[in-house]
Interface confidence: medium
């Protein structure tokens, strides 16, 4: 089977070759900026820092949204732009940085129910089921959309952050999306240095809690890019 670690909305709407051709299970994701692709058992990134073209917000990094680079510009040319911080103007939730949402045209601090999950709708299960069909290709799985009568506890499956109890968010964890804790000071966080790379993670972390931001750990400056740890630190 194709052991690609390709994930959800970030690839579901892309045409081949980015989305992978259905008839070619061996084809890796092509060399798009920051996209992870299978090279044997190593998942590599392509260091290309051009503006990342996009069609929707989900194709951009956590701290980005998809829009035309110029005001009133050609809607057909969209790239990933830096998210808007608190009290900045916005037109939709995705424009606001994690931990904020768009209210009355302004980015404001969010509660759990307004957290912009990175993958809110469906999950692409790209490992392929070990009891899958004969073609052995990766297949698509959608989580059941049952209503949650009680808020999900840590580790329980979820579709969106509003399914989770207070202090938790809904994030990808290997095979599914589960409720995970919002990160505290000193805890490891994920900083998406390469545009678009978050969409292909098989793991996600929640965002850092109030008053914290995800920054490189001071004693890891000498480490190689791939091994650098980021932690939630006070602003």
């Amino acid at each position: 089977t194709l052991n690609s670690v390709l994930n959800s909305n970030a690839i579901k709407n892309l045409p081949p070759p980015l989305g992978g051709a259905a008839g070619h299970p061996g084809s890796a994701v092509s060399a798009a900026p920051g996209i992870l692709y299978p090279g044997g058992n190593k998942y590599q990134t392509i260091d290309n820092y051009q503006p990342y073209p996009c069609a929707e917000d989900e194709e951009c990094g956590t701290d980005e949204y998809c829009a035309s680079p110029t005001r009133g510009g050609d809607a057909g040319v969209q790239i990933c732009l830096a998210c808007r911080k608190r009290r900045k103007r916005c037109m939709r939730h995705a424009m606001c940085c994690p931990g904020n949402y768009c209210k009355n045209g302004i980015c404001v601090s969010s509660d759990q129910n307004h957290f912009r999950g990175e993958i809110e709708e469906t999950i692409t299960e790209s490992f392929g089921n070990d009891h899958s069909t004969l073609d052995g290709y990766s297949r698509r799985t959608t989580l059941s959309s049952k209503m949650y009568h009680t808020k999900g506890q840590e580790g329980s499956v979820c579709l969106r952050s509003s399914d989770c109890a207070s202090g938790l968010c809904c994030a990808r964890h290997f095979w599914s999306k589960i409720c995970k804790p919002v990160l505290k000071e000193g805890q490891v966080c994920t900083k998406h240095r390469r545009k678009g790379s978050h969409g292909l993670e098989i793991f996600q972390r929640c965002y850092c809690g109030e008053g914290l931001s995800c920054r490189i750990q001071k004693d890891h400056h000498q480490a190689s890019n791939s091994s650098r740890l980021h932690t939630c630190q006070r602003h």
């Epitope: 058992n41 290997f174 095979w175």
Partner: antibody, heavy 116, light 111 residues
């Protein structure tokens, strides 16, 4: 509190079959992925299989693929492991574990001995 | 067929600090910032002590801490106590067919 209780272990001959069960209580079983992990006598832990909360996805370690089948009955809060074509190297204590953020709760295990 | 490498044994005196290492490759431990540690007393089931590199589940003493650099993760136990004597296993994920990998285990002896 979360409780997982395995049963069904025992002595079986090589080539034989066995079905393990894991009764879950103290949490919403249908909302969690579940795994089986085994430990050969005096050895380390080895992941065996995992099943999604709604049974739509299953994964197996290469060492058991094609011989073991994981399943669950959410109405009975029970996880199963059907083990066929058993080999001597399958001898181990089999644990069921809740796979939340990693294996956050474990049962006490049931011993499976494959010997002639 | 153990994917992650741990020392077979470590020891320390009560009150001391000890560190257990866990080494993998870029295809498993080094590729993901997701490492867990489990404690197992003889005849008992394993217990999750650390997840996501350095997060402690509720109820786990803050004497236990985790870290990671490159392809190596570490579990540090400070203020060693007699009840810490147990086997410790690291666990990570892998990009190959074996999707969950454990270390071979480290026996901690409190002198």
């Amino acid at each position: 509190q979360v409780q997982l209780v395995e049963s069904g272990g025992g002595l079986v001959q090589p080539g034989g079959s066995l079905r393990l069960s894991c009764a879950a209580s103290g949490f919403t079983f249908s909302s969690y992925w579940m795994s089986w992990v085994r430990q050969a006598p005096g050895k380390g832990l080895e992941w065996v299989s995992v099943i999604s909360s709604d049974s739509s996805s299953t994964y197996y370690a290469d060492s058991v693929k094609g011989r073991f089948t994981i399943s669950r009955d959410n109405s009975k809060n029970t996880l199963y492991l059907q083990m066929n074509s058993l080999r001597a190297e399958d001898t181990a204590v089999y644990y069921c574990a809740r796979h939340g953020i990693d294996f956050d709760h474990w049962g006490q295990g049931t011993l499976v001995t494959v010997s002639s | 067929d153990i994917a992650l490498t741990q020392p077979a044994s470590v020891s320390g005196s009560p009150g001391q600090s000890i560190t257990i290492s866990c080494t993998g490759t870029s295809s498993d431990l080094g590729g993901y910032n997701y490492v867990s540690w489990y404690q197992q007393h003889p005849g008992k089931a394993p217990k999750l002590m650390i997840y996501d590199v350095n997060n402690r589940p509720s109820g786990v003493s803050n004497r236990f801490s985790g870290s990671k650099s490159g392809n190596t993760a570490s579990l540090t136990i400070s203020g060693l106590q007699a009840e810490d004597e147990a086997d410790y296993y690291c666990q990570s994920y892998a990009s190959g067919n074996t999707k969950v990998v454990f270390g071979g285990g480290t026996k901690l002896t409190v002198l």
